[in-house]
């Protein structure tokens, strides 16, 4: 049943945890709540996965399609450069910035934003799955 | 490029109303986190903030002075506008925009990265 | 309201010589996520407000290393090393943590 269809929730595909969503490889937990950026990484970090690293544009157009208008923190940080948490630059995408004090990257369903750090949003943590 | 710019009457009368135009380029205040406040130099004094607009049409006004003033935004034409009724010549000032950047509370901002260059604004009868 | 006293309110210097700017708050301005939004601005005649540093002791975009922020809880300190002409001005440091967002009176950086 998973692997016949392109995406799937828990209710119908066990390999991935409850509240979890799987596409391809991967597991994909898209919170309720709202949290700073940095609480937001180590919420997935505490659950065996990472915020979410998009690997290209099939992948991010596919979860711009389970977002609303309201924005979810990435794994993406200006560092001397937009780049994801392991290091690889944002290279498929434009983010919007034209803030110097804006260093977190999140996405809704149009766009990748730059934003304050500090700001409370929801986010997406994103894992291998079993 | 960021650009702002201020415009307003130059000189008005005690008791009349002051109407400025913040109009700036270079980003959307539609974007989330964007926001533009209001500043003022009088000659001689220390600089105070009077209002701000974010984004999603939250405000914030200087609360000593909120029962005169008014910020409002049009998005479309990249304009925001702040109205100081019943003024007197301690309104006299150079009045400033400034881009304020959101940090999780609508009622203040951090880091006024960018500002117009300033009107002058003088109440005399 | 958040008062921020400046000292000095005049502050002459030879160029060349390292400045010094306090800027006490009336209340401690760490906000409730941890950060402290303390930053300073130089007014120039004739010119704009210009952010040199914002949370206390980063330095803003193309703000020279010369210009170093410091300070926690109420004590807040701008040094300038080797003061140029360019750096004469008043400097007014700033919070936003605390609604609502305020201005010190102002330091002005003069020759001796």
């Known amino acids: 049943l998973c692997q016949g269809s392109k995406y799937s929730t828990c209710a119908s595909c066990p390999s991935c945890p409850d509240h979890w969503m799987k596409y391809g490889n991967h597991c994909y937990y898209f919170s309720v709540e709202k949290k700073d950026w940095i609480s937001s990484l180590e919420f997935c970090l505490a659950r065996d996965s990472h915020l979410l690293m998009i690997t290209d544009k099939q992948e991010m157009s596919l979860l711009q399609d389970f977002l609303s208008e309201a924005f979810h923190w990435v794994g993406l940080r200006n560092n001397s450069g937009w780049r994801w948490e392991d290091g690889s630059p944002l290279n498929f995408s434009r983010i919007y910035s034209n803030s110097l004090v804006q260093t977190c990257g999140a996405i809704n369903k149009n766009s990748l934003q730059a934003s304050s750090c500090e700001v409370s949003l929801q986010w997406v943590c994103k894992k291998v799955s079993p | 490029q960021v650009i702002l710019k201020e415009s307003g009457p130059g000189i008005l009368q005690p008791s009349q109303t002051l109407s400025l135009t913040c109009s700036f380029s270079?980003?959307?205040?539609?974007?989330?986190?964007?926001?533009i406040g209001w500043i003022r130099h009088p000659s001689g004094k220390a600089l105070e903030w009077l209002a701000h607009?974010?984004?999603?049409?939250?405000?914030s006004y200087n609360s000593a002075l909120k029962s005169r003033l008014t910020i409002s935004k049009d998005t479309s034409k990249n304009q925001v506008f702040l109205r100081l009724a019943n003024v007197a010549t301690a309104d006299t000032a150079t009045y400033y925009c400034?881009?304020?950047?959101?940090?999780?509370?609508?009622?203040?901002?951090?880091?006024?990265?960018?500002w117009g260059q300033g009107t002058s604004v003088t109440v005399s009868s | 309201d958040v008062l921020l006293t400046q000292t000095p309110l005049s502050l002459p210097v030879s160029l060349g010589d390292q400045a010094s700017i306090s800027c006490r708050s009336s209340?401690?301005?760490?906000?409730?996520?941890?950060?402290?939004?303390l930053e300073w601005y130089l007014l120039k005649p004739g010119q704009s407000p210009k952010l040199l540093i914002f949370?206390?002791?980063n330095r803003f975009s193309g703000v020279p290393d010369k210009f170093s922020g410091s300070g926690s809880g109420t004590d807040f300190t701008l040094k300038i090393r080797r003061v140029e002409a360019e750096d004469l001005g008043i400097y007014y440091c700033?919070?936003?943590?605390?609604?609502?967002?305020?201005f010190g009176a102002g330091t002005k950086l003069e020759l001796k």
């Open positions: 400034a881009r304020t950047i959101y940090y999780g509370n609508y009622l203040t901002f951090y880091a006024m990265e960018h």
């Open positions: 270079g980003f959307s205040l539609t974007t989330f986190g964007m926001g």
């Open positions: 607009i974010w984004w999603n049409d939250d405000k």
């Open positions: 209340q401690n301005i760490v906000h409730s996520n941890g950060n402290t939004y």
């Open positions: 949370k206390v002791s």
């Open positions: 700033f919070q936003g943590s605390h609604v609502p967002p305020t």
